[in-house]
Each structure stands twice: as structure tokens, then as C-alpha cells.
């Protein structure tokens, strides 16, 4: 089946899609754009706001197969790619493009993964080898982070304070995070 065609870095690009993690310049087939619904009042000044909810970045849906060595997922998985500049939500364009709303000497914001989720994947292997089962880490949502110029150039800082999250929700679901009891005694799911 031409297993050699699959990449060794756990990605196989579906034709028509750019190679991850390079952010696409334009939407292509099999991609949809999902602007983060962050809303909020527009800031008085792009750099003065303390409310991270007033900043937004793009979440691109991205479909691909995953591989582990010579083994490939039976089905493609869909995840998000965090793309584009961060800016006040009211100033972000509706289509992906290069819009410079910031001053050249303004702070540098990056659109990066915020939360992750796990998805079970069955990997089919060539030559009659036993299939594998893995849990792949996928991006669930994106957020804006600020590049700190006072420290290491590569150091990313959260924009705005983070508080304790007793029930953190890393999936795109209600933030209230429940707790469920051990289900081992309830099921023989296999």
C-alpha cells in the first residue's frame, strides 16, 4: 500500500492541505475557519487592555491522518491549527489576510494552542503486523499570548492574569468541569 509515502513525524497531509504547522495563507478545500468567539468591549487602546477576552486569533480546522512509524490511522482526525496574528477582535478581518493594526514598536502577540484534547486512534500497520491503539494529542482551542521583550525573546507570556482553575476544562465544552467516578466496575467495554 505504499506505506513509505507516510511521514514519520506523525502526520500525513491530506492532498489540498498545507503541511502542518505552517499556517495556511488562504482557506483551501476541506478547511473551514472558525473565528474565536471572544467578543468583549473593544479596548480603548490595543496595548492597554487587561482583558484577554478582547483579543482573538483564528482557529483553522485541519484534517489529516496520523502515523506512528509505518502505521497509519484508519481514519483521519480533525484538529485545530492556531493561525494568524492576534489583535482586538473587532479589528480582525473576516477572511484570512495580512492586516497590520499594530504599531511597529508594539508588543508581539502570538496565536498558540490553549487547550488540548485526547482522541483514541487505531493505527493499522503493514505486513500483517498487529494494529496499535494510541491517544493522540490534538489542539482543542487557541489563545493569544504575548512575547515578552524584557526577557528571553522566545518566552511567551499569557496576556492577562490566570486564576486557579479547580475544574479546568481543556475541551471545548462548558468550563465547569465535572468529576466522574471510576467506571472500571461498570463496564467491560472491550
Amino acid at each position: 500500500q505504499g506505506w513509505q509515502a507516510f511521514k514519520n513525524d506523525a502526520t500525513e497531509i491530506i492532498p489540498g492541505l498545507r503541511e502542518y504547522p505552517e499556517p495556511p495563507q488562504e482557506l483551501e478545500n476541506n478547511q473551514t475557519m472558525n473565528r474565536a468567539e471572544n467578543g468583549g468591549r473593544p479596548p480603548h487602546h490595543p496595548y492597554d487592555t487587561k482583558d484577554v477576552s478582547e483579543y482573538s486569533c483564528r482557529e483553522l480546522h485541519y484534517t489529516r491522518f496520523v502515523t506512528d512509524g509505518p502505521c497509519r490511522s484508519a481514519k483521519p482526525v480533525t484538529e485545530l491549527v492556531c493561525s494568524g496574528q492576534c489583535g482586538p477582535a473587532r479589528l480582525l478581518p473576516n477572511a484570512i489576510g495580512r492586516v497590520k493594526w499594530w504599531r511597529p514598536n508594539g508588543p508581539d502577540f502570538r496565536c498558540i494552542p490553549d487547550r488540548y484534547r485526547a482522541q483514541r486512534v487505531q493505527l493499522l500497520c503493514p505486513g500483517g503486523a498487529a494494529p496499535r491503539s494510541r491517544k493522540v494529542r490534538l489542539v482543542a482551542s487557541c489563545k493569544c499570548k504575548r512575547l515578552t521583550r524584557f526577557h528571553n525573546q522566545s518566552e511567551l507570556k499569557d496576556f492577562g492574569p490566570e486564576t486557579a482553575r479547580p475544574q479546568k476544562g481543556r475541551k471545548p465544552r462548558p468550563r465547569a468541569r465535572g468529576a466522574k467516578a471510576n467506571q472500571a466496575e461498570l463496564e467491560n467495554a472491550y
Epitope: A10, D68, D114, R115, Y116, R117, A118, Q119, R120, A130, P131, R132, S133, R134, K135, V136, R137, Q167, K168, G169, R170, K171, R173, R177, G178, A179, K180, N182, Q183, A184, E187, N188, A189, Y190
Partner: antibody
Framework: EVQLVQSGAEVKKPGASVKVSCKVS????????IHWVRQAPGKGLEWMGG????????IYAQKFQGRVTMTEDTSTDTAYMELSSLRSEDTAVYYC??????????????WGQGTLVTVSS | QAVVTQEPSLTVSPGGTVTLTCGSS?????????PYWFQQKPGQAPRTLIS???DKHSWTPARFSGSLLGGKAALTLSGAQPEDEAEYYC?????????FGGGTKLTVL
């Protein structure tokens, strides 16, 4: 490289509560899935609970349901495990463990040094 | 609650081969239980040897390997060394909940 540093040993009286902390470095807490495991003296490992990234919930072992609370403070990259209504059988070393933040979720890859909790009247 | 069973103790000669097994009270262990194997020496925290049935880690000696055998997860040690004497635990994933086995005390004698 993920590193986990836990709080120091505790001595508690029966009926009291204990809160053990687990400080993460090398990655941010929001990138990881923290689980808690305990080991009574001379006994085996026992899973208490942890974050399941598949459905975005903290799952507690049935045995500890209602007595244990696992929380996280992302501003300090510190995870906490609080166990209430302590009894002598809760005397154990408590470990936090996490995945390696790799492309594949592989849990329990990195372990804290353990926190000895002694419950004695 | 599911019960995960291991041999309480096993002995292997230096250079010999031994297989530790891990069974589930709910039925056959499959790849969807993502079996883990840990090594623990006295006074130390556990150390992961195998994840997801057969996936070794950078620190896992090549003489250790994981597999499924006869409806159980298995850890095979080929060419046992004195430093392999330790307690070995398996762990199974039941849909996000985990259960440890009781542990196998491996003696290299």
C-alpha cells in the same frame, strides 16, 4: 523535560484533611494531565484519580469519591490533591505523575518524589 | 471495580528470560486498555518501562519488551541483570479510569 516537585511530609490526626502540592516545571500545567497515585507502606500502587483529556474531566477512583479533590492553579503551575476525613489506612506516600507532553498521550511518564502522609492520633 | 491480577512473585536466573503477565477481571486485556508497565525499587518512585502495550521509553533497557499474550498484557525480560530485581506493576486504562495490578516481586537469583 517535565519535572515534578511535591510538598513535604505531613502528620495528621484522624478526621483531618491534608493537601499535597505538586509543582510542575519544564512545561505549563495546562499542557499536561496530572494523576495522583498512593502507596501504603509495604503495599502496592493505587490510582486515586486524575485528568482525562479525552472528555475534559477529572476522574476519581470510586474508592475515594467524595473524599478527594484534585485542583490546579495554572498561575503557579501547581496541582493539588486534598484528601479529607483521614483515617489510619490513609497513611501512605502520595505521588503525582504526569504525561510527557508528547504527540501521543502517554500518562504516568514523570513522577514526583512522593509525599509521606502519616495519619496518627 | 475491575481487578487487575499479576503473579505475586517470580524468580529468574541472571541472563535468563522471564515473562510477567497482567490480567483483567472484566475479560481479555486488549490494546484498548493501553497497558503500562512500571518498575519500582525500594525507596524510589515508580519508573515507566512500557506504555500502550509495547511502546518503550528512551530510558527503557532493550531487554524489556511489552506485548499481549493469551488475553493478558505481558512484560518479557530477556537477559535478566541483577539490577532488574524490583517490583513490577502493570496498569490498565478503563476508559480514563486506571487500575494498578498488585505487583510482581521479581528476584534475580
Amino acid at each position: 523535560e517535565v519535572q515534578l516537585v511535591q510538598s513535604g511530609a505531613e502528620v495528621k490526626k484522624p478526621g483531618a484533611s491534608v493537601k499535597v502540592s505538586c509543582k510542575v516545571s519544564g512545561y505549563t500545567l495546562s499542557e499536561l494531565s496530572i494523576h495522583w497515585v498512593r502507596q501504603a507502606p509495604g503495599k502496592g500502587l493505587e490510582w486515586m484519580g486524575g485528568f482525562d483529556p479525552e472528555d475534559g474531566e477529572t476522574i476519581y477512583a470510586q474508592k475515594f469519591q467524595g473524599r478527594v479533590t484534585m485542583t490546579e492553579d495554572t498561575s503557579t503551575d501547581t496541582a493539588y490533591m486534598e484528601l479529607s476525613s483521614l483515617r489510619s489506612e490513609d497513611t501512605a506516600v502520595y505521588y503525582c505523575a504526569t504525561d510527557s507532553a508528547g504527540y501521543w498521550y502517554k500518562f504516568f511518564q514523570h513522577w514526583g518524589q512522593g509525599t509521606l502522609v502519616t495519619v496518627s492520633s | 471495580q475491575a481487578v487487575v491480577t499479576q503473579e505475586p512473585s517470580l524468580t529468574v536466573s541472571p541472563g535468563g528470560t522471564v515473562t510477567l503477565t497482567c490480567g483483567s477481571s472484566t475479560g481479555a486485556v486488549t490494546i484498548d486498555h493501553y497497558p503500562y508497565w512500571f518498575q519500582q525499587k525500594p525507596g524510589q518512585a515508580p519508573r515507566t518501562l512500557i506504555s500502550d502495550t509495547d511502546d518503550k521509553h528512551s530510558w527503557t533497557p532493550a531487554r524489556f519488551s511489552g506485548s499481549l499474550l493469551g488475553g493478558k498484557a505481558a512484560l518479557t525480560l530477556s537477559g535478566a541483570q541483577p539490577e532488574d530485581e524490583a517490583e513490577y506493576y502493570c496498569l490498565l486504562d478503563y476508559g480514563g479510569s486506571f487500575v494498578f495490578g498488585g505487583g510482581t516481586k521479581l528476584t534475580v537469583l
